[in-house]
């Protein structure tokens, strides 16, 4: 007969998993804040910039109290997938001006990807229903000009910063309910 079966696999403490997700999110938040500041120094923003293809902010800070874990993680994952796509697009189509933000933009993309994988893992460990596969998103049109790429970068980093700030608050609040 084969080797004796190993001990039953104990699922890690979900609070520890959530802690690890909070740490990654907070680290990415600080990176994003710094990169957005770097962008403002290199290319000062003339007012607020928006990009229609970006997700709307998931939740105001005041509404955090009503959050439920499955909803938060599902929405956060969807929003971060959108931001990952936008960062990839920015690096590919943003133009030569934005090359000055490398390698930081590449590091941001890698950490965003890592956070998404961590969220996926957390959802499976918590036995949450897995979201359906993402429908293929329509391709993002290249910026109309170099300045268009810079405006897009301001919008993407600003939106990502707000989303991650919301995520840290939400995840910490949810941790108290586990």
């Amino acid at each position: 007969p084969g080797p004796p079966p190993g001990p039953p696999r104990v699922s890690p403490d979900p609070r520890a998993e959530l802690d690890s997700t909070v740490l990654l999110t907070r680290s990415l938040l600080a990176d994003t804040r710094q990169l957005a500041a770097q962008l403002r120094d290199k290319f000062p923003a003339d007012g607020d910039h928006n990009l229609d293809s970006l997700p709307t902010l998931a939740m105001s800070a005041g509404a955090l109290g009503a959050l439920q874990l499955p909803g938060v993680l599902t929405r956060l994952r969807a929003d971060l997938l959108s931001y990952l796509r936008h960062v990839q697009w920015l690096r590919r189509a943003g133009g030569s001006s934005l090359k000055t933000l490398e390698p930081e933009l590449g590091t941001l993309q890698a950490r965003l990807d890592r956070l998404l994988r961590r969220l996926q893992l957390l959802m499976s460990r918590l036995a949450l229903p897995q979201p359906p596969p993402d429908p293929p998103a329509p391709p993002l049109a290249p910026p109309s000009s170099a300045w268009g790429g810079i405006r897009a970068a301001h919008a993407i980093l600003g939106g990502l910063h707000l989303t991650l700030d919301w995520a840290v608050r939400g995840l910490l609040l949810l941790k108290t309910r586990l």
Partner: antibody
């Protein structure tokens, strides 16, 4: 050798104003974010304000927001702190500090400090 | 705001002994944003350890840092007379950047 030298401290009445300066040398000033940190007599350290290399992002502690203004002149290798509406609790030694090489590596270089006393 | 609480407030030890200083953080923070400083009377603070465990330039190897999440430690393996000072931890992940209240390391 990195050097930071603060000046401009002194005795000022409550409600008054003061402008601190920090002269930087020994490094490319325009490449680094800069901070002001203060220390009340016999107390601990308190972060006051931060400015990015190009001055386009600025952060303040809540205790000074709306009263203090951080600025810099890269051509003069100088950092400033304009302090208005001063209160007794602003009495402290004020240090300028430079981040290490990356923003997440702490305050690696400090000046010797300049004492601000707010008293009537 | 993230609050850092240092313990003990005062630590009385003799030269040659091992010192262990603690910094407890109110929120989870990534270790790369936790730093330690030393300050002697009448002097500016000096960066000792950055990113929780990296020795700053010119700092002797008897100093070391460790920890993660909410609990961080500064260790001095064998105290030298010049190590008696006040030690501060500081977080740089969130604005406002904050310091602990300090631990005074005094000669027993």
């Amino acid at each position: 050798e990195v050097q930071l030298v603060e000046s401009g401290g002194g005795l000022v009445q409550p409600g008054g104003s003061l402008r601190l300066s920090c002269a930087a040398s020994g490094f490319t000033f325009s490449s680094f974010g800069m901070h002001w940190v203060r220390q009340a007599p016999g107390k601990g350290l308190e972060w006051v304000a931060y400015i990015t290399p190009g001055s386009n992002t600025i952060y303040y502690a809540d205790t000074v927001k709306g009263r203090f203004t951080i600025s810099r002149d890269n051509a003069k290798n100088s950092l400033y702190l304009q302090m208005n509406s001063l209160r007794a609790e602003d009495t402290a030694v004020y240090y300028c500090a430079r981040e290490y090489y990356s923003y997440d590596e702490g305050f690696a270089y400090w000046g010797q400090g300049t004492l601000v006393t707010v008293s009537s | 705001e993230i609050v850092l609480t240092q313990s003990p407030a005062t630590l009385s030890l003799s030269p040659g002994e091992r010192a262990t200083l603690s910094c407890s953080v109110s929120d989870l923070i990534p270790s790369q944003y936790l730093h330690w400083y030393q300050q002697k009377p009448g002097q500016a603070p000096r960066l000792l350890i950055y990113r929780a465990s990296n020795l700053a330039s010119g700092i002797p190897a008897r100093f070391s840092g460790s920890g993660s999440g909410t609990d961080f430690t500064l260790t001095i393996s064998s105290l030298e007379p010049e190590d008696f000072a006040v030690y501060y931890c500081q977080q740089g992940v969130d604005v406002p950047f904050t310091f602990g209240q300090g631990t005074k390391l005094e000669i027993k």
